[in-house]
Structure formats: C-alpha cells, structure tokens
Interface confidence: low
C-alpha cells in the first residue's frame, strides 16, 4: 500500500521536511503533489512525468519544494503556513490512479525566555512574589527550576496562567535561591537566565558570644553580637540599660567586680524596620585565696584512729572538692564528707590511706588546688618473716638470719634462742655452727609508737646427717584432666640436692611433669588416672642421703561410659533377666537403672525374674561420681519373644 512518511513530523520554522514515499507502484506514467487531503488542481504543488523526466510546478508551488524521481518531496525553509496535509497522486501506465496522504506540523524556534517579578525585595513572612516567564508563546509548555532542581512540593508555591506564573506566598529566607523558567515546544527548549530572589529578613534574636557569663577580676571583657539579618543588622550595646556604643563588638579591658551587670545587644534592620535584643548577665568574681588542708591527727594509728581533714579557709556559697592520689574520691564507707564538703573524715585509717590528699575551691571558671598533704599512718608490726627459709644446716657453716616486719615507724628487732635473749638487731649471725646451735630461734618485732609487738619462731637443726624427708601436696584428691598437683619435698635444707622417683623409677620425660624451686617441687599438670602411682623424694649432700616414704596419688576420675553385661539383647519369655552395669571410676560410682525412662533401683545389678514380652524396651544404666561431679549413661534395647519364636537365642539366667 502506498504510504507517506514525514521526516521529521514536527518541523521547526526555517528547517526542512522530507515527505518520503513508501511502496511506490511499478510501471508509472507520473505523479503529482497537492496541498491538502485531496486532489485539487488549484492546490497542485508540482507534477512529474516519468517518460520526459520533467517536473511541472502547480498553482501552490512556492519555489521551496523539490521532487525526487522516487516521488519523495522535500520542502525547505519551512514556514508556519506549511503545516498540514499533503497528498500524492500517482498515475500508472494503465492509467489507474492511486493516492496517499501525509502530514507534518510546523512550530516556531522559541526565543530565550526571561523572568519578570512583581516584587524585587519581599519581606520574610509578609510578602508574596509572582514570577512570570516572558514572552507568552502559543503551543509552548512552561517549566520552572529552583537551584537547578524541579519545583519542590509546597503549599506556598503555586503555578498559574498555564504554568507561566510561579507565585511564592509568605516568602521565607530559605526562598533565597536561583529561579529559572524554561519554555518548550516539540522542536525546541530554552532556559532563562537565573533570577536570585533577595528576601529581606530579621533581625533574629541576636546571640552574644562568647557565652561565658563569669569572669575574674582583671580580665578583659570582649563581647561580640550577631543576628541573622538581610540586609546586615546595625548593632547597639547597653549596660544596665545605659547606651554604650553602636558597634558589633563591646570591649572593656581590665574588668572589676563593678563591671558585673546586664549587658544588652540590640540588632536593627533598617529595611524591615524590626529590632531584636538579647540580654546576658555578666558576673565578675574577685580572685579566691589558695586553699590549704588542716588535720586533727597527724600520726593516726592503723585500725584505731579516725582522721578529719578540713579545707581552709571557710568561704560562704563555695563548692569544695577533694582528691586522693590525684583521683576523685572513691566510694567507701570509711570516707565521709561533711554537708558542705569542707571536711573529709577517714574512719579507722589503714596504711593505704597515706594519700596524698588535695582539696580545691571551685569558682565559675576553674578550681584552685591546695598543696598535697600526706598522712603518717602508724601501723604494725606485722608478723615478722625470717629469711632464708632453710631449717637444716650442716656443722661448720655460718648461720645468718634476717628478720623483717612491715611497720611504721620501722620496727625494733630482738633475737631469742630457746627463749634466751641474744641481741637487739635485725640480723643474727653465728659463725662456724655446731649441733649445739640447734634450737628454737625467735625474732621479736616491736613498734615503739603503737606499743605493739609480734614474734615468729623458727626451728633450726644443725646436723651432718640429713633428716628423713617427707612429701607435702597442695591437692590430695585431684580430678583427672582438670587439676594439677604440686608435691614439695620437706624440709628445705642448705646445699642439698633434691631427687624424685615414681614407682621406684627416675622421673619420665613428659611435658606434664615440671621441676621447680631447685628440684624441691614436682608439679604434675592435667593429672590422669595413670598418675596414681607411688612418689618418693630424696635429699642428699656430700655427707648423707635419705628418702621419704612413698606417697600414692589418689586421682579422681570417671565415670567412663558404662558397659552392660551380658551383651545379649534378645530373650525368651519366661527367662530371668540379670543385667550388670560397670563403669571405671574413682571413687566407685553410684548406679541407677531406668526402664523405658521410668526410674528403677539404685543397684549395680538389675534382676527381673520370668520376663514376658511386656518387659520389652530400653534399659538405661546411669552412673554418677559425686567426687568428680561427672555423670554417664548407656542404653540397651531388650526384646522378649514368646517361647519358641526366637531361634538360637539363649536365655539369661
């Protein structure tokens, strides 16, 4: 079928359009183009005879039309009047006619639009502004852009006049933006230059900075005022209601207490005619004195005395603060503050309460600290310790013992041997000792300030022969895979070698065995049931040797997974069921049975006479070791068949 395609369909004035012919028949005589939707001689544009290849203009020819041999028509320099329908009339060689109609539309190229406004300086929250997009153009679409974004949805924004007018009701400072309008038609789109809306606003309530309201005497007062305003605000300062100056900043050097008062900043906008004020109250403080601490007891006795520390001087309406060891006060029932925080009481002082203590007086800007105070807490003496810890010595060596007891003031020491006073020194020295120097050695520590004394007694044995050693243990009943055991060979003797045997053999190499303390201590980590052996320690020196009695380690373990015997699971009706449960465990476990989940007896053996099919089910043995706190269990299914139906199965007896 013969068709006409317009390329393009929408044509801009001054451009060109091609009426393209599709499906042109064969064997043609010629063809003609007409303006309109029908063949009308008065509206013929051009005719074409194929044989002569001659084009003949018609009454509607404008000189802008070009016909192609394929019947397509090009129209150049399009004008508005060219809009509409065009008909192609085809005359075939057999003189049969065929027609087709096409059309196109002509639109003007749009000019660059501009924005007109009804109010160039609207006042915030008062005025409305109407923007109009110029010029008014037929068949054009109008669009608006704010800060290069499409219009936000807002009840204060309204489009009218075919979107040509944008009205902003009750403008705000946030409407200060770049506004553009755009005109569009099918052949062009143009944007206006931006128009910046200048919204007059403010002044808002001014802010005075810095916000500091408290100053010390002698400082400079420098206040600055700012209020959001368009155009910028004009500022005035008032002190206690009296005008000072018309500046944004107020500066008063070297202030005194007399400069305390109310400071008012007034902001004025000459365009909106509005005034706003803000008032700040400035307080100027005299410099407070440096505080110091007094104490009611400079040498308190530990666990007896209380100490009251007082922060001086006493000042009305002042906040007192305390620090101990440069930290704020810890929460403690032994620390009490008076109602005004000026007195800190330490109830029942300890040696850890020495301090240092500081108090502070707080004013608006900072805290004035006292010098630190340290308490001299009298304590002790604690139980003295005698070193070294050896109790056996060989004849001929020198005995040198030292005594120490924590004490303030430091303790005075005395030594006694078998109750007889020897000397008043911290150290006791006896050269070239003999068996006669064996005995009870007592160190006495005395605190002269508290009057308290404490003593420690040590047995010293001087002998060429070493004593028979013994083994002490830190854990007499360790639990398998959980506990460690430390054996120590006693006594501790000078110049002595310590040896160990397990089951009569020297120690095996094992990462779980560790010797320490000069081989005097043997530690077994993560004990197992296999560690339940006889342990012997030995001591020797150049003169003698001796072995301890064996100590057998009692390792608690289990219970392991129990075993139910006999292993049979099928029985004949009428037989006796006799099940025995066993689990490796130390100490022996407690046994209990459940049949089909129902508790039975707490015995190792479960006996049921003359079983029947009713005795079918699950038989569970539960084991529990109270010493290790561990449990275990096993379940066995028992099937009881009627007599003669279970081939080759023996009955439990």
């Amino acid at each position: 079928k013969l068709t006409i395609e317009s390329t393009p369909f929408n044509v801009a004035e001054g451009k060109e359009v091609l009426l393209l012919v599709h499906n042109l028949p064969q064997h043609l005589f010629g063809y003609s183009w007409y303006k309109g939707e029908r063949v009308d001689g008065n509206r013929q544009i051009i005719g074409y005879v194929i044989g002569t290849q001659q084009a003949t203009p018609g009454p509607a020819y404008s000189g802008r039309e070009i016909i192609y041999p394929n019947a397509s028509l090009l129209i150049q320099n399009i004008i508005q009047n060219d809009t509409g329908f065009y008909t192609l009339h085809v005359i075939k060689s057999d003189l049969v006619n065929e027609e087709a109609t096409g059309q196109f539309r002509v639109y003007p190229e749009l000019p660059k639009p501009s924005i007109s406004s009804n109010n160039s300086k609207p006042v915030e929250d008062k005025d409305a502004v109407a923007f109009t997009c110029e010029p008014e153009t037929q068949d054009a679409t109008y669009l608006w852009w704010v800060n290069n974004q499409s219009l936000p949805v807002s009840p204060r924004l309204q489009l009218s006049n075919g979107n040509r007018t944008l009205t902003l009701f009750n403008v705000t400072r946030n409407d200060t933006a770049s506004y553009k309008c755009e005109t569009q038609n099918p052949v062009s789109a143009r944007r206006s230059d931006s128009v910046i809306l200048n919204v007059l606003y403010g002044p808002d309530a001014p802010t005075i900075s810095p916000l500091n309201t408290s100053y010390r005497s002698g400082e400079n007062l420098n206040l600055s005022c700012h209020a959001a305003s368009n155009p910028p605000a004009q500022y005035s300062w008032f002190v206690n209601g009296t005008f000072q100056q018309s500046t944004q900043e107020l500066f008063i050097p070297n202030i005194t207490v007399n400069n305390s008062g109310s400071y008012t900043c007034q902001a004025h906008n000459s365009d909106t005619g509005l005034n706003r004020t803000t008032v700040t109250t400035i307080t100027v403080y005299a410099e407070p004195p440096k505080p110091f601490i007094t104490s009611n007891n400079s040498n308190p006795v530990e666990d007896e005395d209380a100490v009251a520390l007082t922060c001086e001087p006493e000042i009305q309406n002042t906040t007192y603060l305390w620090w101990v060891n440069n930290q704020s006060l810890p929460v403690s029932p032994r620390l009490q503050l008076s109602n005004d925080n000026r007195t800190l009481t330490l109830l029942s002082v300890t040696r850890n309460d020495v301090g240092p203590y500081e108090c502070g007086i707080q004013n608006e800007l900072s805290v004035d600290h006292s010098d630190p105070v340290i308490l001299n807490v009298l304590y002790g003496p604690d139980d003295p310790t005698i070193s070294p810890s050896y109790t056996y010595y060989r004849p001929g060596v020198n005995l040198s013992l030292s005594c120490h007891a924590a004490s303030n003031p430091p303790a005075q020491y005395s030594w006694l041997i078998d109750g007889n006073i020897q000397q008043h020194t911290q150290e006791l020295f006896i050269s070239n000792i003999t068996e006669k120097n064996s005995g009870l050695y007592t160190c006495q520590a005395n605190n002269s300030a508290s009057g308290h004394s404490r003593t420690t007694v040590k047995t010293i044995t001087v002998s060429a022969e070493l004593p028979k050693p013994s083994i002490s243990s830190n854990n007499s009943k360790p639990v398998e895979d959980k506990d460690a055991v430390a054996f120590t060979c006693e006594p501790e003797a000078q110049n002595t070698t310590y040896l160990w045997w397990v089951n009569g053999q020297s120690l095996p190499v094992s990462p779980r065995l560790q010797l320490s303390n000069g081989n005097r201590t043997l530690t077994l980590f993560n004990v197992t049931r296999n560690d339940a052996r006889a342990y012997v320690c030995g001591i020797q020196n150049s003169v003698s040797a001796n072995r301890s009695d064996p100590v057998t380690l009692d390792v608690l373990y289990g219970p392991d997974t129990p075993i139910i015997s006999p292993p049979d699971s099928s029985y004949l009706s009428g037989a006796n069921l006799n099940l025995s449960c066993h689990s490796a465990s130390n100490p022996s476990p407690q046994y209990s049975w459940r049949i089909n989940g129902i508790p039975q007896q707490h015995t190792q053996v479960l006996f049921i006479a003359k079983i029947t099919p009713n005795n079918n089910g699950t038989y569970a043995c539960f084991v529990s070791n109270l010493a290790t706190g561990r449990n275990n269990s096993i379940v066995k299914s028992i099937t009881v068949s009627a007599s003669g139906t279970s081939p080759g199965l023996s009955a439990g007896a």
């Epitope: 810095p210 502070g360 707080q362 608006e364 800007l365």
Partner: nanobody, 119 residues
Framework: EVQLVESGGGLVQPGGSLRLSCAAS????????IGWVRRAPGKEEELVAQ????????RYADSVKGRFTISADTSKNTAYLQMNSLRAEDTAVYYC????????????WGQGTTVTVSS
C-alpha cells in the same frame, strides 16, 4: 600568659577520622574544664564536647555523641578531640576554649583549626 593552640585540622573524606590537639600554657588544664567549640558559616556556634579533669566528667553535644571522644593528658597539659565517622555537617572551624562546668560558657579562645569533611 594564658594561651591555647589548636592543631590537627585538615581535609578528610566522609566516614574518616581526625584527632585535634589543644596545647595549653599559662595554666593547668587539670584545674578547669576544657571544651571544643565549632563555628560554621550560617550555623550557630556549638559546644561539641567538654572535659573537666578535676572531677572526671565529660559532656557531648547530641550531634556528636558516640562519634567524638574528648580526652586530656595533664602531663602534657594538652586536650584532645578524637573525631570518628565524620560527616559533611561537621565541617567548621574548631576552637579550644576554657569552659564552665555546668553551663556552656567559654573564655580564652584559641586561634582555631579548620576541619573540612568532603568527598
């Protein structure tokens, strides 16, 4: 002479971190409260954090809670502001100031350090 000198500002991407330092001289920071105040064009001055060494308290503006941490090293007489998870709205000039304990009052300003958060 009392002086506060800030440092550590700079350009950082959103989500990044900065640590501001405020070196104090002429007084002991353990005796008072130190605050960080920021000023950005078109925004109100904001006290973002303060630390009072002498009673061990810290306070933060809601806008920075969980992101900023204020601390002080009394041995160096220096306060710090660790700023994590920074946002574009944190862009401002940050000032160190002596601050009152119970209300946002400032005195003795530093010269400021600029923090710009931008991708």
């Amino acid at each position: 002479e009392v002086q506060l000198v800030e440092s550590g500002g700079g350009l950082v991407q959103p989500g990044g971190s900065l640590r501001l330092s405020c070196a104090a001289s002429g007084f002991n920071i353990k005796d008072t409260c130190i605050g960080w105040v920021r000023r950005a064009p078109g925004k109100e001055e904001e006290l973002v954090a303060q630390i009072c060494q002498y009673h061990g308290s810290t306070r933060y503006a809601d806008s920075v809670k969980g992101r900023f941490t204020i601390s002080a090293d009394t041995s160096k007489n220096t306060a710090y502001l660790q700023m994590n998870s920074l946002r574009a709205e944190d862009t401002a000039v940050y000032y160190c100031a002596i601050v009152g304990q119970n209300y946002p009052v400032y005195n003795y300003w530093g010269q400021g350090t600029t923090v710009t958060v931008s991708s």
